[in-house]
Amino acid sequence: IWELKKDVYVVELDWYPDAPGEMVVLTCDTPEEDGITWTLDQSSEVLGSGKTLTIQVKEFGDAGQYTCHKGGEVLSHSLLLLHKKEDGIWSTDILKDQKEPKNKTFLRCEAKNYSGRFTCWWLTTISTDLTFSVKSSRGSSDPQGVTCGAATLSAERVRGDNKEYEYSVECQEDSACPAAEESLPIEVMVDAVHKLKYENYTSSFFIRDIIKPDPPKNLQLKPLKNSRQVEVSWEYPDTWSTPHSYFSLTFCVQVQGKSKREKKDRVFTDKTSATVICRKNASISVRAQDRYYSSSWSEWASVPCS
Amino acid sequence: RAVPGGSSPAWTQCQQLSQKLCTLAWSAHPLVGHMDLREEGDEETTNDVPHIQCGDGCDPQGLRDNSQFCLQRIHQGLIFYEKLLGSDIFTGEPSLLPDSPVGQLHASLLGLSQLLQPEGHHWETQQIPSLSPSQPWQRLLLRFKILRSLQAFVAVAARVFAHGAATLSP
């Protein structure tokens, strides 16, 4: 058993049929010694008396809010949560496996630049009685500070018969050094509590590996005289690190119709313009990637050919 | 050329070669398969490699003030990785595929380090740790980690030279 926060405790249980469970001793936070009784949740049934209560925690029926009273007055509470371990593996029932970029990916994180600011998100099908708490640091043995905000519900989607909820959190490294080569990864830890179930999820990454620039901005077309060709120009996204002579991007320019199966024109360039062949009913799209480190491509920015 | 006396390097040449290094480092990476390094106890095997850190003057402002500190750091790293790529970690079993870009990578690291420090001038170089994995699978894992680390190192070096070529070239 360990303390998650004041008056909230996590009991770690090996979860298998007829498991013996964990013996837990609760102590009433009071100077009183006599006439103390214990109850669980909203029940008035007295579970025991005395300053301490010893219980055998085996299942979710044994978890909940234990309250010690004296003469009708509440003295203190202890909330017990369960953390299940099945076959040596901690349960991951609360969050959905996003399976990208690999199996058992529950947290996904992205950064728009090298400023030390990043966003992480996760998915669940649970809609109520759900709380998240997020902590982060650079490195684990001698951690350097990363400040995270509160996790918020950022999107709701219908997936077949189920509703899926996306939560996200923004974090900022306290003393970021955008130009340096990272040697210690960022660690992100998410505590998830659903009713009386506790789970924790972690992710470890370098900012450089989660970079995904915003799409290029201000796409403009200029038809070339006596030619099917069009000069397309664009600018670096506002959110990208500066100066651009140092933090350079490379671009992919593509002309394609509405269907992915249609023919296309495609060219890669380090410049902020390119000449392509425009077709009726097609769109010109441009996306960006860090020029020197192969992290993710941005989403496409598009303009119609016409 | 960046010499200890403090003259400027051939920024444009360094830019071209460092960009080539980036391309080679990424084409060498798939050679050793895909695995998550952080699940493999990353710290103890690759924390000895030289990293370009915050105080090394490799940021745009630091380069404007005095590029020598940064260039010396890059030079140290290039020599370090050049020696690692020539060591038995890469030459031992399992043999690299004959078409491995590691050979080109090795030569290009040497080429860039020579551009930065011509014959006859000497910056102090960092000791190469004795990483001698006994098992072929350990060697494979170590190659992977070194190449991943090299990708990050050459990316910073390429940014430095691109910025230098754009803003510091005579």
Epitope: E262, K263, D265, D270, R279 | S27
Partner: antibody, heavy 118, light 107 residues
């Protein structure tokens, strides 16, 4: 299977015009760009131009502008290359090539030898 | 027009050898570079697209690398069927242009 089958060899006199064909099969003709590339005996490859069979748009290499005409007939899934004012240096193997991507060549015809000789 | 220069123009090698062919562009072309193989009397065949992307059905012994102005095609462990002429082609801008070719001959 995506295939391009070209018409047979031609022998022409200088100043004449020749029209060679390239019949596509195994795919929807208008879904691919069609290019023409030539190769003089013992020499390298030279790109001449392309056509989008869907709308008839064409683009030619400056060297061949006015010299060649590329057309396409979607009713027969056939592309054509017409070369005018033939000279001995136009003696070459002419290849048609196709791809869904405009700028490189995924599928090639077997080639048509055009010999210009008096 | 962008000029493409291949070297060497010919190379003699034995089965099992590793052969590297280089291609240099007269200006930066990012990764807009493709490689073809041509055997005598046959049409060219696409081997690599966009400098390093493999083509389905092409043996993995063919690999490409490079960006900007310098590119290479490597044939690992040359097979008897690999004796042919190899061409690079830039697609950075029109007109599309090819290198002069590199003939890989039996030693």
């Amino acid at each position: 299977e995506v295939q391009l089958v070209q018409s047979g060899a031609e022998v022409k006199k200088p100043g004449a015009t020749v029209k060679i064909s390239c019949k596509a099969s195994g795919y929807t003709f208008s879904d691919y760009y069609l290019h023409w590339v030539r190769q003089a005996p013992g020499k390298g490859l030279e790109w001449m131009g392309w056509i989008d069979p869907e709308n008839g748009d064409t683009e030619y290499a400056p060297k061949f502008q006015g010299k060649v005409t590329i057309t396409a007939d979607t009713s027969t899934d056939t592309g054509y290359l017409e070369l005018s004012s033939l000279r001995s240096e136009d003696t070459a193997v002419y290849y048609c090539a196709a791809n869904k991507e405009l700028r490189y060549f995924d599928v090639w015809g077997q080639g048509t030898l055009v010999t210009v000789s008096s | 027009d962008i000029q493409m220069t291949q070297s060497p123009s010919s190379v003699s090698a034995s089965v099992g050898d590793r052969v590297t062919i280089t291609c240099r562009a007269s200006q930066s072309i990012s990764i807009n570079l493709h490689w073809y193989q041509q055997k005598p009397g046959k049409a060219p065949k696409l081997l690599i697209k966009f400098a390093s992307q493999s083509i389905s059905g092409v043996p993995s012994r063919f690999s490409g690398s490079g960006s900007g102005t310098d590119f290479s095609l490597t044939i690992n462990s040359l097979q008897p069927e690999d004796f042919a002429t190899y061409y690079c082609q830039q697609s950075n801008s029109f007109p599309l242009t090819f290198g002069g070719g590199t003939k890989v001959e039996i030693k």
